[in-house]
C-alpha cells in the first residue's frame, strides 16, 4: 500500500534505483481552489494572470488563504489526509480560501527527482502569490502555507522566493532524506515566513529518518518525542488489521503530523499543549512543564506566534487518536530511605483521584536511576481530565536491572528466608499540572506510616496548594 514514503527500505531503494514513470509532457503546477467541503466537488483551477477564475470561483481577497502542499507520492492520486485537512480548514475558517497545490506530476517520481523538483514548485507558488499581491486587498500576511513531508520544504522555497513575507508556514513532518543538515536556503527554515511552526512525528536517530530531526522553524514540536507515536506500533497496526506491515507503521507515524494539525482545527475546545525542553529525555523526566516566558504553547493551528532568535524545541505526549489531548503532570517524589534494597531498582505506579475522574494505574517511567535521599522527578499523563487532584495512591515493585542481579536476589532470599522486607520511605509527593500550571503537595495519609514495601500501597492526600513546606530545603531539581 502506498505511503508518503513507503517503508524505510523502500525509500532507501528509491534513493538509489532508477525508476521509469510514465510522463509524456513537462507539466506545470496546478492550483485547485477548493470551493466546498465536499470532496467530490471539482473545485476551481486558478490560472496565473487570469482574473476571471478568481471571480468565478469566489476567491475572497480579504480572507485568509491556505495553500496545502502535498509531498512525494507513489500513487499519483491524493491521499485521504488531504481531504481531511481541506474539510477541517473549511469547518474552522468558513470564509477562507483553501488552495490545494497539485504538483503530482513532479512528485510522482524517483524520490531524488521529486526532491530536485521542490525548488521549481516553490517558485511556482511564489509567482502565484506575487500575482495575487497585485490585486487590491490581498495581503501576504493572510497567507498560510501548510506543507506535508516534502511539501514542507516546497513551502520553504515558496516563502523564500516570494516578494515580501508570508504570514505563516506550518511544516507537517518535513521530509528528512536529503534535507537533514542542509543549508537554510535549501530546506524549510525560520526565515521563510513571519511565523514557522513545525510538527515532527517520524524522526529516528538510527536507521532512515523519514521526517527531519533538526529544528527548522521558530517552534518545533516533537509529539511523543517525535519518534514512536501511540497507536502506530507494529502491535497496534497488526492488531487493527489482518495484513499489517511496516509500511503501515511508517505511514501512521509520518502522517500523524497531519492528523494532529486537523485535530487542532476541529477540536478547538481540547487544545494540546507542548512544553519547551532541551531534549526528549529531560521532558520524559517531567522537568519541562513550565509555561513561564513563553515556554509552553498550543500545537497546530492554535499555536501562538513566537519569533525566537533560536529554534525552540517543544514536547508533549498525546493519545493514540483524536482528540489527541492529554493532561501532563510533573511528580516529585522524595525517597527518604531504602531498606534492604540490594540491587533492586524500584518501579513506581500511581493512581490519581480527582474531582472529575480517577486515572488508571500509571507507571512512572524511569529515565535515570532512582536516587535515595533525593527528589526524583517523573512525568505522568492521563487521557481524561481528572479535575482537581484530591489524592494519590502509590505502589512500587522491584525490577531487577539484570539477570545476574535477579539471580543474586533469589540466592540471597533462599539463603536468608527471614530477610526483613524491602522498603522505601516516602512522605510526600509534589505535583504540578502542565495544563493549569497549578502546584500541589500531597502528604502521606498516616504521617507515622510512610514506609512502603513492594506490592503494598501508600495513600497521599492533598495537604496544601503550592510546594513550599516549612523548614524544608529546596528540591534538588527545580523547574526551568
Amino acid at each position: 500500500s502506498p505511503t508518503p514514503f513507503g517503508p524505510e527500505g523502500q525509500l532507501a531503494d528509491e534513493l538509489h534505483k532508477p525508476k521509469a514513470i510514465q510522463t509524456e509532457v513537462k507539466p506545470s503546477v496546478r492550483f485547485n481552489l477548493r470551493t466546498s467541503k465536499d470532496p467530490e466537488h471539482e473545485g476551481c483551477y486558478l490560472s496565473l494572470g487570469h482574473s476571471q477564475p478568481l471571480e468565478d470561483c469566489g476567491f475572497n481577497m480579504t480572507a485568509k488563504t491556505f495553500f496545502i502542499i502535498h509531498g512525494w507520492t507513489m500513487s499519483g492520486i491524493f491521499e485521504n489526509w488531504l481531504h481531511k485537512l481541506v474539510s477541517a480548514l473549511h469547518t474552522r475558517e468558513k470564509d477562507a480560501n483553501v488552495v490545494v497545490v497539485d504538483w503530482l506530476p513532479l512528485a510522482h517520481q524517483l524520490y531524488t527527482d521529486a526532491v530536485n523538483n521542490t525548488r521549481v514548485v516553490g517558485h511556482s507558488i511564489a509567482r502565484m502569490l506575487d500575482w495575487l499581491q497585485e490585486k487590491d486587498d490581498f495581503s501576504l500576511g493572510n497567507v498560510h502555507l501548510i506543507g506535508y513531508s516534502l511539501g514542507a520544504h516546497v513551502a520553504g522555497y515558496a516563502g523564500n522566493f516570494v516578494k515580501g513575507t508570508v504570514g505563516r508556514i506550518t511544516g507537517l513532518d518535513p521530509a528528512g532524506p536529503m534535507f537533514e543538515g542542509a543549508d537554510i536556503h535549501k530546506r524549510l527554515s525560520p526565515d521563510d515566513a513571519d511565523f514557522v511552526d513545525v510538527l515532527h512525528t517520524y524522526t529516528r536517530s538510527f536507521g532512515l529518518s523519514i521526517g527531519i530531526q533538526m529544528p527548522v522553524g521558530h517552534i518545533d514540536i516533537y509529539p511523543n518525542g517525535g519518534d514512536f507515536q501511540p497507536g502506530c506500533g507494529l502491535n497496534d497496526v497488526l492488531g487493527s488489521m489482518a495484513y499489517g506491515t511496516i509500511t503501515e507503521v511508517v505511514k501512521c507515524e509520518h502522517e500523524r503530523a497531519v492528523h494532529l494539525f486537523v485535530d487542532s482545527l476541529v477540536n478547538q475546545d481540547k487544545p494540546s499543549f507542548a512544553f519547551q525542553c532541551t531534549d526528549s529525555n529531560r521532558f520524559k523526566k517531567g522537568i519541562c512543564l513550565s509555561c513561564r516566558k513563553n515556554r509552553c504553547n498550543s500545537i497546530g493551528y492554535n499555536a501562538k506566534k513566537m519569533r525566537n532568535k533560536r529554534n525552540s524545541k517543544m514536547y508533549l505526549k498525546t493519545r493514540a487518536g483524536m482528540p489527541f489531548r492529554v493532561y501532563h503532570y510533573q511528580m516529585k517524589i522524595h525517597v527518604f530511605s531504602y531498606k534492604n534494597m540490594g540491587e533492586i531498582e524500584p518501579t513506581f505506579y500511581v493512581t490519581l483521584y480527582g474531582t472529575n475522574a480517577d486515572s488508571q494505574t500509571l507507571p512512572l517511567e524511569i529515565v535515570e536511576r532512582i536516587e535515595q535521599n533525593a527528589t526524583n522527578t517523573f512525568l505522568v499523563y492521563t487521557e481524561e481530565d481528572l479535575g482537581d487532584l484530591l489524592k494519590i495512591q502509590l505502589t512500587w515493585e522491584g525490577a531487577s536491572q539484570s539477570w545476574y542481579n535477579l539471580w543474586k536476589e533469589l540466592r540471597s532470599y533462599l539463603s536468608q528466608p527471614h530477610n526483613p522486607g524491602r522498603e522505601l520511605n516516602i512522605r510526600r509527593i509534589r505535583v504540578k499540572s502542565g495544563e493549569t500550571q497549578r502546584k500541589l503537595t500531597f502528604c502521606a495519609e498516616d504521617p507515622e506510616n510512610t514506609s512502603i514495601s513492594p506490592g503494598r500501597e501508600l495513600w497521599f492526600r492533598k495537604c496544601r496548594d503550592g510546594w513550599r513546606m516549612k523548614n524544608e530545603t529546596s528540591p534538588t531539581v527545580e523547574l526551568p
Epitope: I21, Q22, E40, E42, I77, F78, N80, D102
Partner: antibody
Framework: QVQLVQSGAEVKKPGASVKVSCKAS????????IHWVRQAPGQGLEWMGH????????NNNEKFKDRVTMTRDTSISTAYMELSRLRSDDTAVYYC?????????????WGQGTTVTVSS | DIQMTQSPSSLSASVGDRVTITCRAS??????LNWYQQKPGKAPKLLIS???KLHSGVPSRFSGSGSGTDFTLTISSLQREDFATYYC?????????FGQGTKLEIK
C-alpha cells in the same frame, strides 16, 4: 452529462495482448482519474489500476504488475488499458470508471464495459 | 490488501420489505466506504459514498451507516427495480478492494 464510452468486445488467444479504450465526455478529462476494474464471469469486481490523465502517472494493482499498461491521449479525452500475456483466467468484462482526486472518492461514473474472451 | 467481506452472499426478499446488507473491512477504513448496485449485463452504479452520502438521483429509500470496520446498506422499502447485486468498496488504501457482492433476489 458525464459519459464514458468503451471499445467493443475482443476475442484473443493466450499469450496475446488486448488494448481497451475509454472515451470521456461531459467533463474536463484532466480533472479526474480514470480507473480500470474487471469482472470475471459470475465473479466480483477487481481493481486493476488507474491513470491520472493530467500528466499520465499510473499506479497498478500489484497482482497485474508488469502485465498492465495504462496510457491516455488528452487531445481526444481517451484512456487506454493494455493487458499483455493474456491467460484464460483474464476472460472478463473490463470497465473504466471515473474517480475524483482522492483515494476516498467513489467511482461515480462507469463505462459500459468491454468483454474480453481469452480462448485458444 | 484490505479484505472486504459482505453478508449475506444472497438474499431473498419481497417488494416492500426492509433489507439490510452488511460489509466488514479487515481494518479500520475511516468511513471511506462506497456502495454500488449492479444489474445483469450492466456496469455498476454508485449508490452511496463516504458511508452515508447518497449519490445524486438515488432514491432516499437507500441509506448507509457504520464506522471503523462495520458498515450497512439499508433499503427501507424494497421496490421491484432494486433486485440486483450490491457491492461495497473501500477507498482508504491502495489497492482499492470490493466486497464479493450480495445478490438480492425476489422471494
Amino acid at each position: 452529462q458525464v459519459q464514458l464510452v468503451q471499445s467493443g468486445a475482443e476475442v484473443k488467444k493466450p499469450g496475446a495482448s488486448v488494448k481497451v479504450s475509454c472515451k470521456a465526455s461531459g467533463y474536463t478529462f484532466t480533472d479526474n482519474t480514470i480507473h480500470w476494474v474487471r469482472q470475471a464471469p459470475g465473479q466480483g469486481l477487481e481493481w486493476m489500476g488507474h491513470i491520472n490523465p493530467y500528466y499520465g502517472g499510473t499506479n497498478n494493482n500489484e497482482k497485474f504488475k508488469d502485465r498492465v499498461t495504462m496510457t491516455r491521449d488528452t487531445s481526444i479525452s481517451t484512456a487506454y488499458m493494455e493487458l499483455s500475456r493474456l491467460r484464460s483466467d483474464d476472460t472478463a468484462v473490463y470497465y473504466c470508471a471515473r474517480k475524483g482526486i482522492y483515494y476516498s472518492s467513489p467511482f461515480d461514473y462507469w463505462g459500459q464495459g468491454t468483454t474480453v474472451t481469452v480462448s485458444s | 490488501d484490505i479484505q472486504m467481506t459482505q453478508s449475506p452472499s444472497s438474499l431473498s426478499a419481497s417488494v416492500g420489505d426492509r433489507v439490510t446488507i452488511t460489509c466488514r473491512a479487515s481494518q479500520d477504513i475511516n468511513n471511506y466506504l462506497n456502495w454500488y448496485q449492479q444489474k445483469p449485463g450492466k456496469a455498476p452504479k454508485l449508490l452511496i459514498s463516504y458511508t452515508s452520502k447518497l449519490h445524486s438521483g438515488v432514491p432516499s429509500r437507500f441509506s448507509g451507516s457504520g464506522s471503523g470496520t462495520d458498515f450497512t446498506l439499508t433499503i427501507s422499502s424494497l421496490q421491484r427495480e432494486d433486485f440486483a447485486t450490491y457491492y461495497c468498496q473501500q477507498g482508504n488504501t491502495l489497492p482499492f478492494t470490493f466486497g464479493q457482492g450480495t445478490k438480492l433476489e425476489i422471494k
